[in-house]
Amino acid sequence: EAHKSEIAHRYNDLGEQHFKGLVLIAFSQYLQKCSYDEHAKLVQEVTDFAKTCVADESAANCDKSLHTLFGDKLCAIPNLRENYGELADCCTKQEPERNECFLQHKDDNPSLPPFERPEAEAMCTSFKENPTTFMGHYLHEVARRHPYFYAPELLYYAEQYNEILTQCCAEADKESCLTPKLDGVKEKALVSSVRQRMKCSSMQKFGERAFKAWAVARLSQTFPNADFAEITKLATDLTKVNKECCHGDLLECADDRAELAKYMCENQATISSKLQTCCDKPLLKKAHCLSEVEHDTMPADLPAIAADFVEDQEVCKNYAEAKDVFLGTFLYEYSRRHPDYSVSLLLRLAKKYEATLEKCCAEANPPACYGTVLAEFQPLVEEPKNLVKTNCDLYEKLGEYGFQNAILVRYTQKAPQVSTPTLVEAARNLGRVGTKCCTLPEDQRLPCVEDYLSAILNRVCLLHEKTPVSEHVTKCCSGSLVERRPCFSALTVDETYVPKEFKAETFTFHSDICTLPEKEKQIKKQTALAELVKHKPKATAEQLKTVMDDFAQFLDTCCKAADKDTCFSTEGPNLVTRCKDALA
């Protein structure tokens, strides 16, 4: 139903705390360089204005759209052009073009320093002094670094953060209580960020239909007892929610997500037997819980998929009558039978089925033509299964760091033109798939591995889009989202690449490396590894292992030496010489 004042409506629905959090996230995601204080001031002004509209919906400007209200606020910021360059040109446009312009200027890789966590005592002091400001800083810092972070989910992570601090700041040993818990939240939030970015990419590049197909497959796997109409309803609503968040309509998105959670909890009987635990929780926890609820038990009496989609004499008639519905029912039926497949694989199978019907239904004898379609799925299914087996075996053999290095070598060979920091970030993220997925039960590995890899490769594509350097990467990133991972997996050494000349300074290290945290040390070593591969793209695994072992030994020796600086300056050049010889 239409409301006189959209801003009053959303304020009333969401409540002041969530309203303010979402407005702060929205501003931080649009203007990523502004300080927390600048955004906090705007948020307060917007909130005060919303309250006047709640009191009187007919008050001046209360009837304006949220885009107009928020855009006007952003465009009133002083020195916009100096700080943001051409983004200021957006302010010369009218809505809805102005908002589209803001969206186009979101930066997936802003030049902001890494978000450093203060030490425990300092954190607890500032948290106790002003919990609201502390959490506001958290929302601001995460949102500006992740401009597509799913806003209602970021509120959930902030709530988690709050609970951890409340608990740990009361303990004697704050550090050992906080560190593992906050690391856990950070890891989950980072995965949530790349997954949501993938959803927004799907929406932006291929439209709502593509996202809805993803949602149908995912929901059918999770709720195999819900009927097709129910799954389609949920997918339609979920598509709306995600479209709003990806489009910067964060208040509408959070409000509609709460509505969807409410609907699911009121209709558990027709959706799933596994929802009750989630539905007993408060709003943010409930919606988060529903988004990762365990799969319901599959119905025992499901007929073979072939009955309706291959053997039925009316396949072509049914397809012609309503293509989207027929393909939707195929995707639904196949997905509910295969919780052990990745969504990407299910969408590839549905695409194959559609292509087969398009071809066969135009022929003289369609059943003879599409009769073998299910057998033709086999290679499509085997390929990711082999990928999972090979990679999980390698992960179990090498451990996470070694597995990351193996991936780093592989991907540097595939796309040596890509910048070393991007390759290292990608390999570290891709390598985490082992820890995340390879320890799971067999039937959960494939969906975990492939859907996670797809999300990470989407980030690779986004970063590469800004500065395209590799034809290999451009080729894989230009196709459909579901074909990206197989495309990257199939890439081999780039034969067109002219190796980088050997520069001694790239492999020169100083004693400051010794005091770095383990993660930073690893990144330094992995940076050197990528540079080695760029110098010798066809170096064997043995050669690279020899060099890296030597490098690790050198660091170990010099970091234990009494005079570290002398050790680094004398042993460093020897290491460089040995490296060159080993790779010659």
Epitope: D227, F228, T232
Partner: nanobody, 117 residues
Framework: EVQLLESGGGLVQPGGSLRLSCAAS????????MGWVRQAPGKGLEWVSL????????YYADSVKGRFTISRDNSKNTLYLQMNSLRAEDTAVYYC??????????WGQGTLVTVSS
Amino acid sequence: EVQLLESGGGLVQPGGSLRLSCAASGFTFNHYTMGWVRQAPGKGLEWVSLIHPSGTVIYYADSVKGRFTISRDNSKNTLYLQMNSLRAEDTAVYYCAKWSSRAFDYWGQGTLVTVSS
């Protein structure tokens, strides 16, 4: 027994509008997805739209998107189809139908819509 009774059809000029209604009885209307299907003279069936019990629209045929709007009033056990910007190719018998799990299981008698100048 399940009964579906369509009304609202008739002759309309191109660019004009019509609103079809379907009165349902004999089943718990607000538990079922409902839809409209049409059959043009000498042609096969074409699905037009589907609506979930909650009122969420879950399907429009590409040929009617942006022109037709499906809706329902569960308190009145009635399904509607608002048809705007009608074209000659929309001429057909329009059937109201009840969806059950994976297909339509009950149909009305149909109402004829003729778009002609």
